[in-house]
Structure formats: structure tokens, C-alpha cells
């Protein structure tokens, strides 16, 4: 249950997360399981521990083995195991099965291929993508953030896709590649002009000064998996990232849910330590897809504090 397989290629970066989780305040220690020898935390080492992460910069075939992580809370130690295998680079084009990440399926309307494990790394766009070892070229292929989008997907697009990116650690660059299979399936779906379920148009949200507040922007876009649909928040008509108020943040990543077969997305706006000036702002929930954009506006009003126990 608390063991995880990880793999990589020699001379590439490999970062492994401890299969046991904890709080930011918990300390995490890493050990070589066979020798019980502690893994150093100093970054000058090629293999070093950094909290929940074990970093091989770069990896070597000899690093293969089982690693133990112990997440230490004040009163309980949680133990996990990372089974790491580092392979020699293949001289030919074929990617063996043991290097493949989980297969993803796509359709004409949705053809996102996420680059596996990329969230563990410190990388900057753009990603490079390859299919069956050939660099992808042409307007049908678009590298967007951590995924590849293929326009007008056809059955011939099925195959093995490799993403390649650079991990940066203290100014040093390390290459990383990851490969997964992509299959194409037929899907009877449709897309609609976005329908915002929450918040209601011109909604007044009561908040307590000094407390945290959450606003959820939730919209549906049609049936089946959607191609290019998004929800986001704006403050006074400005993107959250451009507004420059660190207390107000959008929740990273959009949650996709299917209610009654509809494809819906939601984005949470988190306001820490609500201040008087926050009541003066206009909060816009935006939902957009290929059909267009819909906007619902929310304003905040002060509510009297209530007992927060019950």
C-alpha cells in the first residue's frame, strides 16, 4: 500500500515523492533500505533528500534499489518505500514497456496528453514532444503548459508520445523524458455555450473580516470530454496573477466533474485574512470555451462574526 515504483534513465534527472504524506511541519528522512544509511540533505550530493522528495541529479544505473522514507509527526512515524529502477538509455527508437507511464485515451473533441510526473520538477515551458521518437511538427500539435493538444484527432494519432523537458536545480540543468501511450476512441459528445452554475449573477457573498473566504466559480460546457474549456476568476477585470495581491489566489488546477453526464469545471478563489478593501473589489467568474465567454459578477459584504466552534 505504501510502496511506489519509480523509474528513470541514466544521466537524466529523477525525482521521487515519498508514498506517505504528511503536513508541512512533519520532517521526512530518507534511507537506503539495504544499508539503512541516511541519505544526505545537502544539495551538493548527486543523490539527496529534500523533504518529501528524493532527487537523483542525475540518476545512475547503480542507484536502482529500494529507498525508505519516514514521515515523522510529533507522535507517529509513517514509513513508505520507493522502488527505484534506473535503466540504460536505449540506442534504438523503441521505448520498452517498463519505461511507459499509464496509457491515456483521447477523442476528436479532447486530445490532451499530460506529461507524466512533471509536477515534481522545476521546469519551464516549452515542453518538447515526440511521437515514436519523431519530433512533432505542424499546426495540429500544440504544447500547452504540461500537456500536448492535438487538433482534429484521427486514429493514426495513436502511439507512444514522449515529453522532454529541463529540470533546473540551483542553476544546473538536467534533462528528463517520460513516455506514455495514447489511444483514440470514438465519443458521442457535444459542447455548449458555457453555463455558470455558481455563483449566481450579481451574487452578494457575506464574509468575515480577518477570516478566510472561498469563492467557487463552477460552469458546465456540454457532454463528454471537452476540448478547450476553462473557468477562471478576475479581480476588477484583471487576471488574479496580474492583480498582485498575494492574499488572493486561485486554486491551482481545475477540478473536472461530470454531473448528469455534463462536463463541468470549477475554480476556487481563496482570500486569506479578508480585509475591508476586499469588499470594494469586483469578483468576476469567467467561463469560456470555443462557443464564447460568460461572466458572473460577485461582490463581498461584511457579515457579523459567528461562534466558529460548532
Amino acid at each position: 500500500k505504501f510502496s511506489k515504483q519509480s523509474w528513470g534513465l541514466e544521466n537524466e534527472a529523477l525525482i521521487v515523492r515519498c508514498p506517505r504524506q504528511g503536513k508541512p511541519s512533519y520532517t521526512v528522512d530518507w534511507y537506503y533500505s539495504q544499508t539503512n544509511k541516511s541519505i544526505p540533505t545537502q544539495e551538493r550530493n548527486r543523490v539527496f533528500a529534500s523533504g518529501q522528495l528524493l532527487k537523483f541529479l542525475p540518476a545512475a544505473v547503480a542507484d536502482s534499489g529500494i529507498y525508505t522514507c519516514i514521515v515523522r509527526s510529533p507522535t507517529f512515524n509513517r514509513t513508505g518505500y520507493a522502488n527505484v529502477t534506473i535503466y540504460k538509455k536505449q540506442s534504438d527508437c523503441n521505448v520498452p514497456d517498463y519505461l511507459m507511464y499509464s496509457t491515456v485515451s483521447g477523442s476528436e473533441k479532447n486530445s490532451k496528453i499530460y506529461c507524466p510526473t512533471i509536477d515534481l520538477y522545476n521546469w519551464t515551458a516549452p515542453l518538447e514532444w515526440f511521437k515514436n521518437c519523431q519530433a512533432l511538427q505542424g499546426s495540429r500539435y500544440r504544447a500547452h503548459k504540461s500537456f500536448l493538444v492535438i487538433d482534429n484527432v484521427m486514429t493514426e494519432d495513436a502511439g507512444d508520445y514522449t515529453c522532454k523537458f529541463i529540470h533546473n536545480e540551483n542553476g544546473a540543468n538536467y534533462s528528463v523524458t517520460a513516455t506514455r501511450s495514447f489511444t483514440v476512441k470514438d465519443e458521442q459528445g457535444f459542447s455548449l455555450f458555457p453555463v455558470i452554475g455558481a455563483p449566481a449573477q450579481n451574487e452578494i457573498k457575506e464574509v468575515e473580516i480577518g477570516k478566510n473566504a472561498n469563492l467557487t466559480c463552477s460552469a458546465c460546457f456540454g457532454k463528454g470530454t471537452q476540448f478547450l474549456a476553462a473557468v477562471l476568476w478576475q479581480l476588477n477585470g484583471t487576471k488574479i496573477t496580474d492583480f498582485g495581491e498575494p492574499r488572493i489566489q486561485q486554486e491551482e488546477g481545475q477540478n473536472q466533474s461530470f454531473s448528469n453526464g455534463l462536463a463541468c469545471l470549477d475554480m476556487v478563489l481563496r482570500i486569506a485574512d479578508v480585509k475591508e478593501e476586499d469588499l470594494l473589489l469586483q469578483y468576476d467568474c469567467l467561463a469560456l470555451n470555443l462557443h464564447g465567454l460568460r461572466r458572473h459578477t460577485v461582490r463581498l459584504s461584511r457579515k457579523n462574526p459567528i461562534d466558529h466552534h460548532s
Partner: antibody, heavy 120, light 111 residues
Framework: QVTLKESGPTLVKPTQTLTLTCTFS??????????VGWIRQPPGKALEWLAH???????QYNPALKSRLTITKDTSKNQVVLTMTNMDPVDTATYYC????????????WGQGTTVTVSS | DIVLTQSPASLAVSPGQRATITCRAS??????????MQWYQQKPGQPPKLLIY???NVESGVPARFSGSGSGTDFTLTINPVEANDTANYYC?????????FGQGTKLEIK
Amino acid sequence: QVTLKESGPTLVKPTQTLTLTCTFSGFSLSTSGMGVGWIRQPPGKALEWLAHIWWDDVKQYNPALKSRLTITKDTSKNQVVLTMTNMDPVDTATYYCAHIGGDYDYFDFWGQGTTVTVSS
Amino acid sequence: DIVLTQSPASLAVSPGQRATITCRASESVEYSGTSLMQWYQQKPGQPPKLLIYVASNVESGVPARFSGSGSGTDFTLTINPVEANDTANYYCQQSRKVPWTFGQGTKLEIK
């Protein structure tokens, strides 16, 4: 908004087993770092920690009562259940469940409590 | 078990004055440089309410009149200035070791 509510019998006979349910909202016990604990308070006395359960099903008990206590969770129902066997009149108390949150481990939200009397 | 001893058992303070409650632990409650000591307020018929966590952090929504200090084994809850509605029992609690333990409580009355 985090809320918790305790439910269970108000009167229990000696030697019987007490089953208390904590139903909560505003958080999920499948989220890393979350926990729910039980605390009791005899009339006019101090608080006593009984047990708590974490997001990953790690359970911790008060050693003085461990042989009598069982704590379980039902993540889908947002519930935590505490059972206490072989009840005795000295177990008469208000029983609270509480949320363990924050970067560190402490009770930051409490239920209103449920009063349990042990008497024949 | 870590035993927490509060003093005084009770005290009476006039509005506008300072109230100081101390809590001594039988062993250190430090963990990675942090003191795992909390303070709770409990009014009659109500559940405890978190005031201070990890020794000195004031919980959101708690008035700045409440402050906590200390490290290792000796901790203090200070209420300054005291107001009439501060009448309550106050408990310290450690989460450094199982069993988590509470102090025996301090009863604060307003004159």
C-alpha cells in the same frame, strides 16, 4: 466552514458498550494532514483526550483506555465512530469530537458535545 | 505521560487589568524547534475554543488581547486587558506526545 456534531445515546447501563458518531462537514478525511479526535469531560472536571484518527487511517489511543476504545472512519459519509466497551459510572461525561488541522497538530474546531450518563 | 500543571487554579481580575495563567509541562513539548502547546477557553455549557496554538500563535478571530508565550516546559497565557466576557475556564494542552494531555484548568473570574 468546518462543523462537527456528536450523536449517540444519552444513557448507558454499566458494562454496556457506548457507540458515538461524529458527523462533520467543511473538510474531507481523505485530505492529507486531516484528523478527527475524541475528548471527554466529566462534570466539573478537566478535559481528557481519548483517541484520534488520521486521513491515512492511522489510529492513536489514550493508553489508559486503549483496551476499551475503537475508532473508525467512513470517509464517504464524513463520519468518525468511537466505541467504548464496558462502560462504568465514572465514564459519565460530555464527549466532544474535534477537527485536527493546521500545519501542526491541534484541535481547532470542536463539536457542541453530547452528554452521556452511565447508570443502571 | 506529559503532565501539565496550571497555576493558579483560579483567579479574579478587574476589567482592564492583566490576567496571567501559567502552564508547566513535566517534560519538553518541543518538536523541530516548535512548542506544541495550545490554550483553550471554555465557557459554561460550551465546547472549548482554541485561542493560541503552538505556544504563541493567536487563532484567527481571537482578539489580540490574548497572547501566548514560552518554550520547552514553561508557558504563559496573558489576557490584557481583561473584559467582562472573559469569564471562563482556560486549559493548556500539549500535542507533542501521545497521550495528548490537558492541564487541570484555571477558572478566571472578573471582579
